[in-house]
């Protein structure tokens, strides 16, 4: 659920990290409506995710121990 | 050791609700999802919906939306599935099991299983 | 919904046989799969997830090999216990989605 690159809501759906090429943070505080989390999948879309939620979290902090290694 | 036990066996009316338990121990109840999943008379397994006991979190396959509602207590580390307006069709056995994200998202321990019959 | 399909439904083998059940997704899930064995009367057991990960427990003589959309069960010499219902499981995306599972039978 976006709109001019702003999610106005979040996915029901849990997704798998095999899934996930990577994320992007949406900030209420930067011109959109809500806190996201945006997940960029292997099939060229992008899903929008409640940052408060344990499954995006525990994606977030594969991905980004993910970066760090590299 | 993980275990996750359910209660016993139902028999209920068309129409009627029933709320199986499952209750766990072993594991720290709140770091891990807790599925169900059900098998009908001669059917394959078919996941229901899956709850985040740390925060509620809900998400269920179309199919159960409105039929099934999954609770918890984290108090008493109990799962709860809810069955509203049986139908002969719901008569399965019904399984509550551990997803665990640590190991692919498998479902690695199982209830024993709650057999719900549905008959007038 | 991503769709799991198993082949064969049901299949004859004895013990000692090398065995290998198949499991075929609508789609690319990107080895999000696990597999399951369930006996009559008893709970599923995980014993494969990652499409290559032998669970905790497991017998080494099981095995799981695949990507993309299909994947593939072996079984290297069949034992009495190993006689049970194989399910394939998907994992990419909720809803999570079985095959329809195979029933492994004494010949």
């Known amino acids: 659920a976006s709109n001019f690159d702003c999610c106005l809501g979040y996915t029901d759906r849990i997704l798998h990290p095999k899934f996930i090429v990577g994320f992007t943070r949406q900030l209420a505080n930067e011109g959109c409506d809500i806190n996201a989390i945006i997940f960029h999948t292997k099939k060229k879309l992008s899903v929008c995710a409640n940052p408060k939620q344990t499954w995006v979290k525990y994606i977030v902090r594969l991905l980004s121990k993910k970066v760090k290694n590299m | 050791q993980v275990q996750l036990v359910q209660s016993g066996a139902e028999v209920k009316k068309p129409g009627a609700s029933v709320k199986v338990s499952c209750k766990a121990s072993g594991y720290t109840f709140t770091n891990y999802w807790m599925h169900w999943v059900r098998q009908a008379p001669g059917q394959g397994l078919e996941w229901m919906g899956v709850i985040d006991p740390s925060d509620s979190y809900t998400t269920y396959n179309q199919k159960f939306k409105g039929k099934a509602t999954l609770t918890v207590d984290t108090s008493t580390s109990t799962a709860y599935m809810e069955l509203s307006s049986l139908r002969s069709e719901d008569t399965a056995v019904y399984y509550c099991?551990?997803?665990?994200?640590?190991?692919?998202?498998?479902?690695?321990?199982w209830g024993q299983g709650t057999l719900v019959t549905v008959s007038s | 919904d991503i769709q799991m399909t198993q082949s064969p439904s049901s299949l004859s083998a004895s013990v000692g046989d090398r065995v290998t059940i198949t499991c075929g997704a609508s789609?690319?899930?990107?080895?999000?799969l696990n597999w399951y064995q369930r006996k009559p009367g008893k709970a599923p057991k995980l014993l494969i997830y990652?499409?290559?990960n032998l669970a905790d427990g497991v017998p080494s003589r099981f095995s799981g090999s695949g990507s993309g959309r299909d994947y593939t069960l072996t079984i290297s010499s069949l034992q009495p216990e190993d006689f049970a219902t194989y399910y394939c499981?998907?994992?990419?995306?909720?809803?999570?989605?079985f095959g329809q599972g195979t029933k492994l039978e004494i010949k």
């Open positions: 990652g499409a290559t």
């Open positions: 499981q998907n994992v990419l995306i909720t809803p999570y989605t």
């Open positions: 789609e690319n899930i990107y080895g999000a």
């Open positions: 099991t551990r997803g665990n994200y640590g190991v692919d998202y498998a479902m690695d321990y």
